[in-house]
């Protein structure tokens, strides 16, 4: 049994998350994950799910009763989702920590928007000429 | 020229994001995107970046001066990042809108944690037996 299982069961007790009523009104994550089979689509969704759990764990980090469980699960996420790659985890954390209400952050984000957009689709990696054919060819003339 | 470019320039004016000082203290997103070449890694990062922009746009949705620009850019993101797939966009939006402080959401999230964790690594897709060899076979006895 993977080590996170025991610790997740401990969290379930702490949050009363084993009660039958928890399943009411569908799932948060599981149905969404079932919808997406492609690895890149899954990563888009899992990225949001992992950031949710990290925020949740942060809110309870000082509670001694679940500290060990939280630490074990976070370590497991780092091995499985981030491939034990601290640089990947650090970059991810930076992105999740930007404040959308900070005017300096807003200005930077808008300043970078054109370049971010240019890289959004996988096609962006196959060279400018090919990409422009892909998109321009699919767009009505302006 | 892609349609978002003109609208992003309009946003730059609105946010004074063309000023030279905006580039101080490094980039928010661009340096991070440069670090990641693998498509699945890029999606992990872009997922957070796109959710940041969506939050930013939400905060300014009632400002008439930039409404058209914001809508054009959002449409372009939907084409490029979500492949014009409304279900993908809807699932993404659901994930970004969950409140981490809502106790019902917390309970559901903890209830689903074991299954979410089981699917986190790409290895999870190659069948339970093979995956257990990858991780369990490489773990010391507890």
């Amino acid at each position: 049994q993977d080590p996170y299982v025991k610790e997740a069961e401990n969290l379930k007790k702490y949050f009363n998350a084993g009660d039958p009523d928890v399943a009411d009104n569908g799932t948060l994550f599981l149905d969404i994950l079932r919808n997406w089979k492609e690895e890149s689509d899954r990563k888009i969704m899992q990225s949001q799910i992992v950031s949710f759990y990290f925020k949740l764990f942060k809110n309870f980090k000082d509670d001694q009763r679940i500290q060990k469980s939280v630490e074990t699960i976070k370590e497991d996420i780092n091995v499985k989702f981030f491939n034990s790659n601290k640089k990947k985890r650090d970059d991810f954390e930076k992105l999740t920590n930007y404040s959308v209400t900070d005017s300096n952050v807003q200005r930077k984000a808008v300043h970078e928007l054109i370049q971010v957009m240019a890289e959004l689709s996988p096609a962006a990696k196959i060279g400018k000429r090919k990409r422009s054919q892909m998109f321009r060819g699919r767009r009505a003339s302006q | 020229q892609d349609p978002y470019v003109k609208e992003a320039e309009n946003l730059k004016k609105y946010f004074n994001a063309g000023d030279p000082d905006v580039a101080d203290n490094g980039t928010l997103f661009l340096d991070i995107l440069r670090n990641w070449k693998e498509e699945s890694d890029r999606k992990i990062m872009q997922s957070q970046i796109v959710s940041f922009y969506f939050k930013l746009f939400k905060n300014f949705k009632d400002d008439q001066r930039i409404q058209k620009s914001v809508e054009t850019i959002k449409e372009d993101i939907n084409v490029k990042f979500f492949n014009s797939n409304k279900k993908k966009r809807d699932d993404f939006e659901k994930l970004t809108n969950y409140s981490v402080t809502d106790s019902n959401v917390q309970r559901k999230a903890v209830h689903e944690l074991i299954q979410v964790m089981a699917e986190l690594s790409p290895a999870a897709k190659i069948g339970k037996r093979k995956r257990s060899q990858m991780f369990r076979g490489r773990r010391a006895s507890q």
Partner: antibody, heavy 124, light 111 residues
Amino acid sequence: EVQLVESGGGLVKPGDSLTVSCVASGFTFSNYFIHWVRQAPGKGLEWVATISGRTKYMFYSDSLRGRFTVSRDNAANSVYLHMSSLRGEDTALYYCVRGYDHSDSNSAADLLHWGRGTLVTVSS
Amino acid sequence: NFMLTQPLSVSGYPGKTIVISCVRSSGSVASHYVQWFQQRPGSAPAMVIYEDSHRPSGIPDRFSGSVDASSNSASLTISGLKTEDEADYFCQSYYGNNQVLFGGGTKLTVL
């Protein structure tokens, strides 16, 4: 003060097995990955294996997987490297090195703290 | 096969600046942190740079690290060279899931 102390090295014959140990102190042991790194006389550094903190996942150098097994006892603040079917080229100083705390995004640097090493000599 | 390639030896005069390169053979150097270690004869390696460009406490600012994605390499720069800097220097990074990789080492001689 962070300390890592290796022991259990010695002279063994080719084909024999040996387990070297590392006892750690000065930090919350169970939170940290631990690496084994070796250095043959007059040669460079070679990574051998890593074991994660609470989850105890094991990672091995491709060239050594199958012959070497890493394990840990968090209650005893100890990590072990079991080496079997030893060969002359396994002769080296074996270092125990502290890795990241992967449960903490502000973890101290990986491979910052090294033990002094324990010498394993494989010879007939 | 993943490799980190360093020059076998580098030399410089006291007070001068030397650069040791570390070229990654495959995969992106920017996708994993790079560390640098100094090893004097008879001692365990000691970290001089971690996470690309950071110095552990006690390491003087004469030591600096950088990563260049265009050449897929990392560099250790030592300025104001001192005789005590004479040692072997190893770069280190990662591949796969927590697979640790060391460069072959560079012998620094202070002339």
